[in-house]
Interface confidence: low
């Protein structure tokens, strides 16, 4: 039996059709196609809601870039 076979895996079957303001986003994680039917990005909002988004959409890519820069910038 593979390691962590019982670890929950999250997949996306549908994507949000609404652009989410980057100010409402706290983090994201990528979902790879080997585990799921579709490649996806799951954004976690500041109220801890998880939302599936299409990584091919420009706003999704821009939001990921923004969050990446946020994590690289040390908080004062």
């Amino acid at each position: 039996q593979p390691d962590a076979i019982n670890a929950p895996v999250t997949c996306c079957y549908n994507f949000t059709n609404r652009k989410i303001s980057v100010q409402r986003l706290a983090s994201y994680r990528r979902i790879t196609s080997s585990k799921c039917p579709k490649e996806a990005v799951i954004f976690k909002t500041i109220v801890a809601k998880e939302i599936c988004a299409d990584p091919k959409q420009k706003w999704v890519q821009d939001s990921m870039d923004h969050l990446d820069k946020q994590t690289q910038t040390p908080k004062t």
């Epitope: 019982n6 895996v9 988004a53």
Partner: nanobody
């Protein structure tokens, strides 16, 4: 808690067929969308097919489309994977999984897994 037990695996020649079964016990089976995954030696677990709990909608990985068919029998608490035109690259341990709650935006978490059944396709 849901218990899932797979069966139907075995050794088959390329081009042959197998039908896998996944029997569920525990909570109401019809409350769950059901999925098949597979894991080949040294490789990552891979999505194969899914069937919804409500309308029987099905989803397939590109690698199995047209060859594999997922179905379910809620009266028997069982989900099936009919595998035709098998190829050596289909060799793997096949696992069924029960989907937990899904979010409005389509995120799905797999809460329960079976122990797996070995499928070996020889050339």
């Amino acid at each position: 808690e849901v218990q899932l037990v797979e069966s139907g695996g075995g050794l088959v020649q390329a081009g042959g067929s197998l039908r896998l079964s996944c029997a569920a016990s525990g909570r109401t089976f019809s409350n769950y969308a059901m999925d098949w995954f597979r894991q080949a030696p040294g490789k990552e677990r891979e999505f194969v097919a899914a069937i919804s709990k409500s309308d029987g909608s099905t989803y397939y990985a590109d690698s199995v489309k047209g060859r594999f068919t997922i179905s379910r029998d809620n009266a028997k608490n069982t989900v099936y994977l009919q595998m035709n035109s098998l190829k050596p690259e289909d060799t793997a341990v096949y696992y069924c999984a029960a989907e937990g709650d899904s979010s409005p935006m389509g995120g799905v978490t797999y809460d329960y897994w079976g122990q797996g059944t070995q499928v070996t396709v020889s050339s």
